[in-house]
């Protein structure tokens, strides 16, 4: 009987999670005489197979980062191997899992900031990439400062935009940074996927060296 997993040859779309060990058939196509067998073409990548009787399955785990959509065609053939139905498009959409960790483009960043710079104005960007789907939490990155060295009076002089990786001064940093007292700082920045919201997220860290330069602008005398 026809149902969710079997039926006639017609255009269809299936969604399958990547990384899953093949465990079940995708679909059983039913042949209408004179069709006696089926043929699969397209982006099979030697993963997708159709048996003569119309059983469509995959023989190893899919990888969305290799191919996010497999465009296949299935045709029904008669006893001479002549196409008598189709080919019809069969689309396999590969659903993302969190199987890639974010990585910073550089293991070390260097930048400089002038004392008294406007708070919130970016002077340096750190950037990480994640091969997972950015439209899902798996590929949504969250940046944060782990350590600031030196840390004076437990006050953070630097801040980071959690989404963009833009580093800027805090209000305190704008007011208190003084190259005569501390000409350089080091930040350890982390990036997490899953929007930083999950214990199962992957992370990476990078180091940022910041030079504080003197503000040479002097207020005009009255």
């Amino acid at each position: 009987q026809e149902g969710k997993f079997s039926g006639p040859l017609k255009p269809m779309t299936f969604s399958i999670y990547e990384g899953q060990e093949p465990s079940q058939i995708i679909f059983q196509f039913k042949a209408n005489p004179p069709a006696v067998t089926f043929e699969l073409t397209g982006e099979t990548d030697n993963i997708f197979v159709i048996e003569r009787e119309g059983l469509l399955y995959y023989n190893r785990a899919l990888d969305r980062e290799t191919r996010s959509t497999h465009n296949l065609q299935v045709a029904a053939l008669d006893a001479n191997g002549i196409i008598v139905e189709g080919p019809v498009p069969i689309t396999i959409k590969v659903k993302d899992i969190n199987d890639n960790r974010p990585t910073f483009l550089q293991s070390k960043y260097e930048g400089s900031v002038r004392q008294n710079s406007r708070p919130g104005k970016p002077f340096l960007y750190v950037n990480a990439t994640d091969l997972d789907d950015p439209a899902t939490p798996n590929g949504q990155l969250y940046y944060q400062i782990v350590i600031q060295l030196p840390m004076i009076n437990n006050v953070m002089y630097f801040q980071i935009n959690n989404k963009t990786g833009a580093i800027s001064l805090t209000r305190e940093g704008s007011q208190e940074l003084n190259p005569a007292k501390n000409p350089s700082y080091n930040l350890v920045i982390s990036v997490k996927d899953m929007g930083g919201q999950s214990e199962n997220s992957f992370s990476d860290t990078t180091s940022v060296d910041i030079i504080v330069t003197e503000n040479i602008w002097k207020a005009p005398k009255p």
Epitope: P33, P34, V36, L77, D78, A79, N80, G81, I82
Partner: antibody, heavy 118, light 108 residues
Framework: QVQLQQSGAELARPGASVKMSCKAS????????MHWVKQRPGQGLEWIGY????????YYNQKFKDKATLTADKSSSTAYMQLSGLTSEDSTVYYC???????????WGAGTTVTVSS | EIVLTQSPPLMAASPGEKVTITCSVS???????LHWYQQKSETSPKPWIY???NLASGVPIRFSGSGSGTSYSLTISSMEAEDAATYYC?????????FGAGTKLELK
């Protein structure tokens, strides 16, 4: 070895019918399609149609749809072609040939000659 | 239906001569679906070349086939007396299966 043994020559009157046979040996009869081909003297080859002995499904060239009837008998590994409403145009040689899946006619019979005469 | 046009219809070649027979197909087909048969008088056709370029069992290696799309050919590198016969091309792409009208090759 693989062979297709066709029946002997047929002599028939106009309007009559003839039924010729093609006995297969040396292979599994139901694993291949059987085709019939017409060849008029000094002329080319014309494909009449085929039968799939496994399912008894047959398919005809439109030109021969009302002329030929293809059947098969699994028990004797024999394919048959009946020609009806015979005219002088049907006087010629008819071959059976084995069809190879996604392939070609890999084995041919020796042919059966049909003569239509009043 | 797919029409196959062979040329020349009739030709003569001397022993040792190179021979080329062509088969033009009315619409593009896969090369795996174009075949050649040899027929000598009073005998049934024999499979000669299948899938454009594959020689059937027992066919001498002086024969070769090539082509794609709508243009195919059979070549004999060096004509021999036993090659005198009629050669037919045939398509296995769609129904009805069709043959070319044949090329009769004679020995000069």
């Amino acid at each position: 070895q693989v062979q297709l043994q066709q029946s002997g020559a047929e002599l028939a009157r106009p309007g009559a019918s003839v039924k010729m046979s093609c006995k297969a040996s040396g292979y599994t009869f139901t694993s291949y399609t059987m085709h019939w081909v017409k060849q008029r003297p000094g002329q080319g080859l014309e494909w009449i149609g085929y039968i799939d002995p496994k399912s008894d499904y047959n398919y005809y060239n439109q030109k021969f749809k009302d002329k030929a009837t293809l059947t098969a008998d699994k028990s004797s590994s024999t394919a048959y072609m009946q020609l009806s409403g015979l005219t002088s145009e049907d006087s010629t040689v008819y071959y059976c040939a084995r069809g190879f899946f996604k392939g070609y006619f890999d084995v041919w019979g020796a042919g059966t000659t049909v003569t239509v005469s009043s | 239906e797919i029409v196959l046009t062979q040329s020349p219809p009739l030709m003569a070649a001397s022993p040792g001569e190179k021979v080329t027979i062509t088969c033009s197909v009315s619409s593009s087909i896969s090369s795996s679906n174009l075949h050649w048969y040899q027929q000598k008088s009073e005998t049934s056709p024999k499979p000669w070349i299948y899938g454009t370029s594959n020689l059937a069992s027992g066919v001498p290696i002086r024969f070769s086939g090539s082509g794609s799309g709508t243009s195919y050919s059979l070549t004999i590198s060096s004509m021999e007396a036993e090659d005198a016969a009629t050669y037919y091309c045939q398509q296995w792409t769609s129904y009805p299966f069709t043959f070319g009208a044949g090329t009769k090759l004679e020995l000069k």
